[in-house]
């Protein structure tokens, strides 16, 4: 029987160089498959596949080609009818737009376009047009779309070609032609400056064309070796030193790159004659010295002789001999305000040149001027004076109380100063101040001035009050009418916070300091500022209160057998509270009560009447105990009223007043009776009252009054007093 044809042969994936085939196994039994496919050349290629195969990839195909595929099942010599399918490989992405974007004299820049991520690499060929010599090949990564091609010949036509490689397949070649530019040339060369032993050379050249310039300096008409130097390619000028005077030179310059050197440019020049000694000048003049400068070629003279003579004087000149290498000399020891003639000779092996001469007048001796007391304080003065710059070694200042013969206070100050503070003086005292300057041991005339120190302003009694967790008040005393401002500095003792400074009006004597952190130790510094005076700083310390976590321990409802303890605490701050009650004499065991963190009061009962107790309340948070709040209390029997006072007494009435006991009572009972005897009268008033009117009294009679406090069935001890009606 005939073999079944393989079923549903199809192409599931196409790529540029491969096709993926899928099929289903035929029903009838068979041994193997034979797969045949046609090449673009017309040839057929056959492949034998095992019977369990249901897919196969044809590889190594050409992009953009159609392929015929036949699949046959075989058993022994029997073959099924072939299953057929036709498919084309993908077109290879094309290279496009090969352009030469930049042309240099020794290189080109290529750009091209191509599909992204398509190429493994590109191969670029560069060949001189019209030449058959081997081309230059470059392989560049497939990610590039531009490349620089260096190392080409100047002014030369080139053919550039490129192809891409995809999975071993080469794309068609793109080509372009371009010519390199002309070799850059040096422009012109000029000698900008000529001296007797040096010259300056300038030249022009294109920017960035040369790595360096090679310069040769050769004496004309001699066989002496040339002087060679190289300078960086960025320079366009250089100095050529070390030349001979009055000599012809030929100078050549070349631009040099890695590959070539330009044609040299040349220039000829004649150096100047050697100058004579010249230009004797005085560059600095002071009252006792001057500085000479002169010019002369190096190596010309062995030494110089300088003569300094006062003009119009016949006394001997002052002579100095200095080495031939010097071109400058300081002449000290002159007289102030004096004309001098200075002459200079050069000497060569004992031969002296004709002298150069210069006349000069030394400065007048510097004077001190304008001694002034510019600021007056209560304990010091500020002196200012004027004087020539850099003239003085130091100044000597004398300060003496006007009406005292005791030794003056002397200060020696650097000569650079023109002002000084003189501290440590007595307040409200007249002083004479004098000053002189010292110049190399010479004293200037003395200048003097008189001034009185001011009355001493005072601040004191810095007090801190009304301390809260975030603020406190300050108060102080100060001399009236003197201070412009007060400066308050608040510094925390641990120096963890920034110093806060307040400047307030000099009229103020109090300040409210707020915005402070709680539980912090502060030092407060106060100083007063009056015109030109800041007082000594005074200080005080303050500690802001802690933010209340546990506070306000209160004892209420005191009675003979107990009392109520209450306190305040931050919401949800404590897990529990511990209330400890100890008798003041420490005779009894302490009583401890542990309460939940939500409770704020505890009623204590069963205590002993009339003894003192200490109550302590602590909070606990995660096992940590706060420092306790403490209070002391005495249990007592019903408290008696106190201080009976009578007022508003008439013939038949009077007002009686009293002070209520500490503990709350329900009522007061007032009993009054004439001292001579009779029936007692009684009035009961509410426990909140502290006075009542007694009426229907007999004129001119002395009454005895007693008052007791009552609560429930308890009565206090009475308190008594007496009065007489009018």
């Amino acid at each position: 029987s005939e073999l079944d044809t393989p079923k549903d042969l199809q192409v599931s994936e196409t790529a540029e160089t491969s096709l993926t085939l899928l099929w289903k196994t035929p029903l009838a039994k068979f041994d193997r498959y034979r797969l045949n496919y046609s090449l673009p050349t017309g040839q057929w290629v056959g492949v034998q596949l095992p019977r369990n195969t249901t897919s196969y990839v044809l590889r190594g195909l050409e992009p953009g080609q159609e392929y015929n595929v036949l699949l046959t099942a075989e058993k022994g010599r029997h073959k099924s009818k072939p299953a057929r399918v036709k498919a084309s490989t993908e077109q290879a992405p094309e290279l496009e737009n090969l352009t030469v974007t930049e042309v240099g004299w020794d290189g080109l820049r290529l750009n091209w376009t191509a599909a992204d991520q398509a190429y493994e690499h590109f191969i670029i060929q560069v060949q001189e047009a019209n030449k058959v010599e081997a081309a230059r090949n470059l392989t560049v990564p497939g990610s590039l779309r531009a490349v620089d091609i260096p190392g080409l010949k100047a002014a030369t036509p080139y053919t550039v070609s490129i192809y891409g490689v995809i999975q071993g397949y080469r794309t068609p070649v793109l080509s372009a032609e371009a010519s390199t530019g002309e070799t850059p040339n040096l422009g012109e060369v000029v000698v900008a400056e000529v001296g007797w032993d040096a010259l300056k050379l300038n030249w022009t050249a294109p920017e960035g064309a040369y790595e360096y310039f090679f310069i040769q300096v050769q004496e004309a008409d001699t066989v002496e070796a040339a002087q060679n130097l190289t300078v960086p390619g960025g320079l366009r000028s250089t100095d050529l030193p070390g030349l001979k005077a009055a000599t012809h030179y030929t100078i050549t310059i070349r631009g040099v790159t890695q590959d070539f050197s330009t044609t040299p440019l040349s220039v000829e020049v004649l150096t100047e004659e050697v100058p004579d000694m010249g230009n004797l000048t005085v560059t600095e003049v002071s009252w006792d010295a001057l500085r000479l400068n002169w010019t002369t070629p190096d190596g010309t003279y062995d030494q110089f002789t300088i003569q300094v003579q006062e003009a119009d004087q016949v006394e001997e000149a002052h002579n100095l001999t200095v080495p031939g290498s010097l071109r400058s000399m300081e002449i000290p020891g002159l007289r102030a305000g004096t004309p001098y003639t200075v002459t200079l000779h050069g000497e060569v092996r004992g031969h002296s040149t004709r002298p150069l001469a210069v006349e000069v007048v030394t400065e007048d001796l510097p004077q001190l001027g304008d001694l002034a007391v510019s600021e007056v304080g209560w304990d010091g003065l500020r002196l200012n004076w004027t004087a020539a710059d850099n003239a003085y070694e130091h100044f000597v200042i004398q300060v003496q109380e006007v009406n005292k013969v005791e030794a003056a206070q002397n200060l020696t100050l650097p000569g650079s100063l023109r002002a000084v503070d003189i501290p440590g003086l007595e307040a409200a005292t007249p002083y004479r101040v004098s000053i002189y300057g010292v110049i190399r041991g010479y004293r200037t005339p003395v200048l003097s001035a008189e001034a009185s120190t001011a009355k001493e302003p005072e601040i004191g009694n810095l007090n801190v009050s009304d301390i809260t967790p975030e603020s406190f008040n300050l108060s102080w005393m100060a001399t009236d009418g003197i201070f412009e401002t007060f400066t308050i500095e608040i510094i925390d003792s641990n120096r963890l916070l920034e110093t806060v400074e307040y400047n307030i009006s000099g009229a103020e004597r109090t300040a409210h300091i707020s915005g402070l952190p709680p539980s912090t130790d502060f030092i407060v510094y106060l100083s007063g500022l009056a015109p030109s005076i800041r007082t000594k700083t005074i200080s005080a310390t303050a500690t802001t209160e802690a933010l209340p976590l546990l506070e306000n321990l209160t004892i209420s409802d005191i009675n003979p057998y107990g009392f109520t303890v209450s306190w305040m605490a931050s919401e949800n701050a404590f897990d529990s509270f511990l209330v400890t009650v100890v008798d003041s004499g420490k005779l009894l065991d302490p009583q401890e009560f542990t309460l939940s963190g939500t409770q704020r009061k505890l009623e204590l009962r069963g205590l002993i009447t009339g003894i003192g107790y200490e109550v302590m309340v602590s909070g606990f948070t995660q096992g940590h105990q706060t420092k306790p709040l403490r209070a002391e209390i005495v249990t007592e029997a019903m408290g008696s009223p106190k201080e009976v006072i009578f007022s508003d007494i008439t013939e038949n009435s009077a007002t009686v007043s009293w002070r209520a006991p500490t503990a709350q009572v329900e009522s007061f009972r007032i009993t009054y009776v004439p001292i001579t005897g009779g029936t007692p009268s009684m009035v009961t008033v509410d426990g909140t009252k502290t006075q009542t009117r007694l009426v229907k009294l007999i004129p001119g009679v002395e009454y005895l009054v007693s008052i007791i406090a009552m609560k429930g069935f308890e009565e206090s001890e009475p308190v008594s007093g007496s009065f007489t009606t009018a």
Partner: antibody
Amino acid sequence: EVQLLESGGGLVQPGGSLRLSCAASGFTFSSYAMSWVRQAPGKGLEWVSAISGSGGSTYYADSVKGRFTISKDNSKNTLYLQMNSLRAEDTAVYYCAKTSPRVPLDYWGQGTLVTVSS
Amino acid sequence: SSELTQDPAVSVALGQTVRVTCQGDSLRSYYASWYQQKPGQAPVLVIYGKNNRPSGIPDRFSGSSSGNTASLTITGAQAEDEADYYCNSINSTRNEVFGGGTKLTVL
């Protein structure tokens, strides 16, 4: 006798997670708050987290907030610390500790080492 | 930075008295607890509250507090007291805070 035994430490990569356990015995576990405290090699003690006896309230150090979760299973007498987004600076010995109403951190376990390294 | 500050190291001659201090704002409101830690061991509570010692802690250990400073005093230091000592308290957010620790050397 109160006993606390930590487990679950080990080597973990940065960004990884780990869960520490602390098995408690010798006291009524549900009545007591518990804490985790850690100690980096050669460094001091650093409190990490705490939980109330019932497990209803939790507290965390700023350095672990949002990354670590403390919990307790009172039926199993076990305290847990779930550590996520671990960093190299979390490398330490982790101790669990018991807290009594008036005595902070009165019993400690022997600790378990957590190493965060790539 | 730690909210509780301790001296890094303190030394004491054998049998002498030494005081280890701890400073911090939370100590204005709360007593400090003190822990002893020996190398390779877990910390041990030695002082808590105003001046309480857990059972088993010798009476040479005592605590005191003033202002924002807490102190642990060892009267007659022994060789076995050589250890690191940490103070501990609680801050306003109910979080535990530890001092940086003090290394005590017994000479």
